[in-house]
C-alpha cells in the first residue's frame, strides 16, 4: 500500500510570541487594540491558553513507499502530514492587536500543507519490466493559515477532536484513503 | 461558582426606555468578554451585543445599532445594556453571556430577564 | 430569517445517532469558527462545541462537531432521553459591520 509507515515521529508549530500567521484584516473600523501601545494587559490575560495542548499544529513524518500499479518506489519517502488544531485560544497577549479574540467566534485557522517539495523517485516494477523514473510531490512543511473559499477542500477536511487527538496508547495513523487517491496525489508532479 | 444574574427587565412603552443589568460573580470578571443575547417567545437565539474589556471592544447586531447601548463596570462586576426607542420586536428573554477564550464561545450564561415592549 | 439554516427539527430513538446540519455561507461558517449551543426545556442555553470540534469540560464526548466549507454538523451518538432540547449553531459573519448570528434552532425529539 502506499501509506507503509514504518517510522512517525512529530513536530508542533507553536508561533512566535505576538506572532500570528496571516492575521485576519479588521473588517470593521480602524482602531488600534494592540494593548502594548497602551501600557499592555496585566500578566493574567483571558485569553492565555489553559492547556498549551489543546491547539497545536502539528508535523507527522511518516516514511512510506510510492507505488503506482505493481511498481514500488526502490527506496522509502518521508513525508509529513499536517495535524491537529489551530486557534487564537493558544496565543499570547501580544497577539490581541490583531483581531477580535474577545469575539464568540472568528477566523478559522486549519494546519494545512504551507511548502511542498518535488522528489524524483524510482519505481521498480515486476516481471522484469524496466524501472521507471517519476517526480513526487510531497508535503514539506505544514502551517495555520485562514480558511478562504480558495483553499482545496481536501486539505480541509475536519475530523473532528477524535481525530486530531490520536488515542493515548495508540501510534498517529495518517488519515485512511483509497488507494488510487493516494497515488494520485503523490504522483502529482511540479 | 460561576453566576451571571441579570435585572431590569419588565413592561415598556414603544419608544420608551430600560436598562438591564447583570451582576456576575464566582470568576474574575475583566477575564471575560460579556454578550447580551435574546430570545423573543417561541423563537430561536439572537445576538445583541457584545463587549471586551474596554469600551474600543464593541460590536452590535444590525437590528439594534444606534438604540442600544452596551456598557461594563469590572469595579462594580456589572455588564449593562442600556435599550432606547424600544420597538415591540425587541420584546424577548435576554439573557447576559460571557466568554474567557477567544473564539470560544459563550460558555458562561445567565437565567434571563423579560423585556415586554407593548403599548 | 436567519442567517444559518437548520432543519427545524429531528428526531431518533436511544442509543441511535443523530446529526444536526448547519449551513451558511462563505462570510459566516466557511471562514469562521462554528459552535454549538444546547437548550433545554425552559433553561438557559450551553455552550456544547466551540471551535467548530471542540467540546468544553463536561460535556460528554458522544457530542461532535465538524465543519467542512460553508456547512457545519453536530452529532450526537448513544442518544439519551435527556438529549431533548433545541440545539443551535453560531457563528461570527464577516457581512456588513459583522455580528454572531446563529441558526434558527433545531428541536431534536428523543422517541419511545
Known amino acids: 500500500q502506499g501509506w507503509q509507515a514504518f517510522k512517525n515521529d512529530a513536530t508542533e508549530i507553536i508561533p512566535e510570541l505576538g506572532e500570528y500567521p496571516e492575521p485576519p484584516p479588521e473588517l470593521e473600523n480602524n482602531k488600534t487594540m494592540n494593548r502594548a501601545e497602551n501600557g499592555g494587559r496585566p500578566p493574567h490575560h483571558p485569553f492565555e491558553t489553559k492547556d498549551v495542548s489543546e491547539y497545536s499544529c502539528r508535523e507527522l513524518h511518516f516514511t512510506r513507499y510510492v507505488t503506482d500499479g505493481q511498481c514500488r518506489s526502490a527506496k522509502p519517502v518521508t513525508e509529513l502530514v499536517c495535524s491537529g488544531q489551530c486557534g487564537p485560544a493558544r496565543l499570547l497577549p501580544n497577539a490581541i492587536g490583531r483581531g477580535k479574540w474577545w469575539r464568540p467566534s472568528g477566523p478559522d485557522f486549519r494546519c494545512i500543507p504551507d511548502r511542498y517539495r518535488a522528489q524524483r523517485v524510482q519505481l521498480l516494477c515486476p516481471g522484469g519490466a524496466a524501472p521507471r523514473a517519476r517526480k513526487v510531490r510531497l508535503v514539506a512543511s505544514c502551517k495555520c493559515k485562514r480558511l478562504t473559499r480558495f483553499h482545496n477542500q481536501s486539505e480541509l477536511k475536519d475530523f473532528g477532536p477524535e481525530a486530531a487527538r490520536p488515542q493515548k496508547g495508540r501510534k498517529p495513523r495518517p488519515r485512511a484513503r483509497g488507494a488510487k487517491a493516494n497515488q494520485a496525489e503523490l504522483e502529482n508532479a511540479y | 461558582e460561576v453566576q451571571l444574574v441579570e435585572s431590569g427587565g419588565g413592561l415598556v412603552q414603544p419608544g420608551r426606555s430600560l436598562r438591564l443589568s447583570c451582576a456576575a460573580s464566582?470568576?474574575?470578571?475583566?477575564?471575560?468578554?460579556l454578550h447580551w443575547v435574546r430570545q423573543a417567545p417561541g423563537k430561536g437565539l439572537e445576538w445583541v451585543s457584545g463587549i471586551g474589556w474596554d469600551e474600543d471592544m464593541i460590536d452590535y447586531a444590525d437590528s439594534v445599532k444606534g438604540r442600544f447601548t452596551i456598557s461594563r463596570d469590572n469595579a462594580k462586576n456589572s455588564l449593562y445594556l442600556q435599550m432606547n426607542s424600544l420597538r415591540v420586536e425587541d420584546t424577548a428573554l435576554y439573557y447576559c453571556?460571557?466568554?474567557?477564550?477567544?473564539?470560544?464561545?459563550?460558555?458562561?450564561w445567565g437565567q434571563g430577564t423579560t423585556v415586554t415592549v407593548s403599548s | 430569517q436567519s442567517v444559518l439554516t437548520q432543519p427545524p427539527s429531528a428526531s431518533g430513538t436511544p442509543g441511535q445517532r443523530v446529526t444536526i446540519s448547519c449551513s451558511g455561507s462563505w462570510s459566516n461558517i466557511g471562514s469562521n469558527t462554528v459552535n454549538w449551543y444546547q437548550q433545554l426545556p425552559g433553561t438557559a442555553p450551553k455552550l456544547l462545541i466551540y471551535n467548530n470540534n471542540q467540546r468544553p469540560s463536561g460535556v460528554p464526548d458522544r457530542f461532535s462537531g465538524s465543519k467542512s466549507g460553508t456547512s457545519a454538523s453536530l452529532a450526537i451518538s448513544g442518544l439519551q432521553s435527556e438529549d431533548e432540547a433545541d440545539y443551535y449553531c453560531?457563528?461570527?459573519?464577516?457581512?456588513?459591520?459583522?455580528?454572531?448570528?446563529f441558526g434558527g434552532g433545531t428541536k431534536l425529539t428523543v422517541l419511545g
Open positions: 453571556a460571557g466568554n474567557n477564550r477567544g473564539y470560544g464561545g459563550l460558555d458562561v
Open positions: 464566582g470568576f474574575t470578571f475583566d477575564d471575560y468578554a
Open positions: 453560531a457563528a461570527w459573519d464577516d457581512s456588513l459591520s459583522g455580528e454572531y448570528v
